[in-house]
Interface confidence: medium
């Protein structure tokens, strides 16, 4: 998987009226990696692993980024034109990738209300709208917004992959991103479920990167996809990743079951506890 | 109390250029979120939206007619202005300016009429 | 463009009665649909915004219903004084677009 850096911002408005303040998180491949705190109005690191990113370096250069994106987003929502009464909001998420082949990609996009209207590659600056017509009039105000000044805008974008770009080499020099390899814990458990069967949930949690086979076997047979069931893979908020897997079985046969776990190279099997 | 006038010259030869005006009080074009259309209609028909302009000077016409029509404002003096390059007939209508912010038009004029005729 | 369509395109009402006009978007518009009258010689009055919010000013037997592409204005108890022409408008998406109008006649 690439690594990427992605952020995510969030302004609203009452009543026509921009609000102030602004919510931000940042993830770094894939992990919860920023937020903005906005009781102190500074950027703030998600969890040990985000601190040992940048080491013993302040956060004021990520608080100023975060703090001047929001103030654009601000400006942005300021200028859509026909706002309701009431609660609504402005997002973007802007996301860039170094790939294993050390091409890149940067991507924009904006959504009001929570609906996608307005896409843009960043290195290319094509936009792209979706079809449905609010969709095109929320990217036409937007847009006439953006390139009211066609070279400063030309420049911020050119600007925002760059700066993207450039934070994420950053965050990946420190080698903790890199480097890191963190070996699952499972946990595997058993509940009751109907009359002469159990359900046996396999857990793995705490583990980096995020790719992981978890699945369940019968004899050293791993069972059809349609037995068993899976959780999603999701962070932790620790830097690392959780996930899981069910099946239900005859109360008995517990010690033909095993759960097998492949985690970057390594794998190991866990059996049911009795 | 909010009022909007609409004044225009009356009558028109075809392939003239049509220039009107909106007058208004009691709200400002400064103001984040207003906008001030042109809505006209011919005698005994509908309505047909035409242009807007908003405070921050942002422009939409109706595509249909957008080759011409041209509008702008005078925040200062509190006035809108409306261009339609080459009317023909088709163009006798009652004109309309109205206010509108969050997505409606809620105060209108009382309409200028224009009548094309050779 | 979304086309409004309206009906009936004439109503012809006794007063007391409560009636129904119809607004029908070419594609879906959620709410954001408005209601204008009209009485003859004089402009357009906003009644109704967003399908169903009341208007501060407009008499409460006006109402509007619906939302994607079907809506509908009622008037619970018609007076004499509502006579004119009804039109709803798109206020979903660019180009703003009127329904031909709906006019209500007292028998």
């Known amino acids: 998987e690439p690594h990427s850096l992605r952020y995510n911002l969030t302004v609203l408005s009452w009543d026509g009226s921009v609000q102030s303040g602004f919510l931000a998180e940042v993830h770094l491949d894939g992990q919860p990696f920023l937020r903005y705190d906005r009781q102190k109005c500074r950027a703030k690191p998600q969890g040990q692993w985000a601190e040992d990113v940048l080491g013993n370096k302040t956060w004021d250069r990520e608080t100023r980024d975060l703090t001047g994106n929001g103030k654009d987003l601000r400006m942005t929502l300021a200028h859509i034109k026909d706002q309701k009464e009431g609660l609504h909001s402005l997002q973007e998420i802007r996301v860039c990738e170094i790939h294993e082949d050390n091409s890149t990609r940067s991507s924009q996009h904006f959504y009001y209300d929570g609906e996608l209207f307005l896409s843009q590659n960043l290195e290319t600056e094509e936009w792209t709208v979706p079809q449905s017509s609010r969709a095109q009039t929320l990217a036409m105000n937007v847009r006439n917004f953006l390139k009211e000044d066609a070279m400063k805008t030309k420049t911020h974008y050119h600007a925002m992959h760059a700066d993207c770009l450039q934070e994420l080499r950053r965050y990946l020099e420190s080698g903790v991103v890199l480097r890191r390899t963190v070996p699952p814990m499972v946990n595997v458990t058993r509940s009751e479920a109907s009359e002469g069967n159990i359900t046996v949930t396999c857990r793995a949690s705490s583990f980096y990167p995020r790719n992981i086979i978890l699945t369940w076997r019968q004899d050293g047979v791993s069972l059809s996809h349609d037995t068993q069931q899976w959780g999603d893979v999701l962070p932790d908020g620790n830097g690392t990743y959780q996930t899981w897997v069910a099946t239900r079985i005859c109360r008995g046969e517990e010690q033909r079951f095993t759960c097998y776990m492949e985690h970057s190279g390594n794998h190991s099997t866990h059996p049911v506890p009795s | 109390q909010i009022t909007l006038k609409e004044s225009g010259p009356g009558i028109l030869k075809p392939s003239q250029t049509l220039s009107l005006t909106c007058s208004f009080s009691?709200?400002?074009?400064?103001?984040?979120?207003?906008?001030v259309g042109w809505i006209r209609q011919p005698s005994g028909k509908g309505l047909e939206w035409l242009a807007h302009?908003?405070?921050?000077?942002?422009?939409y016409y109706n595509p249909s007619l957008k080759s011409q029509l041209t509008i702008s404002k005078d925040t200062s003096r509190n006035q809108v202005f409306l261009r339609i390059t080459s009317v023909d007939t088709a163009d006798t209508a009652t004109y309309y300016c109205?206010?509108?912010?969050?997505?409606?038009?809620?105060?209108w004029g009382q309409g200028t009429t224009l009548t094309v005729s050779s | 463009d979304i086309v409004m369509t309206q009906s009936p395109a004439t109503l012809s009402v006794t007063p007391g009665d409560r009636v129904s006009l119809s607004c029908r978007a070419s594609?879906?518009?959620?709410?954001?649909l408005h209601w204008y009258q009209q009485k003859s010689h004089e402009s357009p009055r906003l009644l109704i915004k967003?399908?169903?919010q009341s208007i501060s000013g407009i008499p409460s037997r006006f109402s509007g219903s619906g939302s994607g592409s079907d809506f509908t204005l009622s008037i619970n108890s018609v007076e004499p004084e509502d006579v004119g022409v009804y039109y709803c408008?798109?206020?979903?998406?660019?180009?703003?677009?009127f329904g031909g109008g709906t006019k209500l006649e007292i028998k």
């Open positions: 109205a206010r509108r912010t969050q997505g409606y038009f809620d105060y």
């Open positions: 594609q879906s518009i959620s709410d954001y």
């Open positions: 302009i908003w405070w921050d000077d942002d422009k």
């Open positions: 009691g709200f400002s074009l400064s103001t984040s979120g207003m906008g």
């Open positions: 408008q798109n206020g979903h998406s660019f180009p703003w677009t």
């Open positions: 967003y399908a169903s």
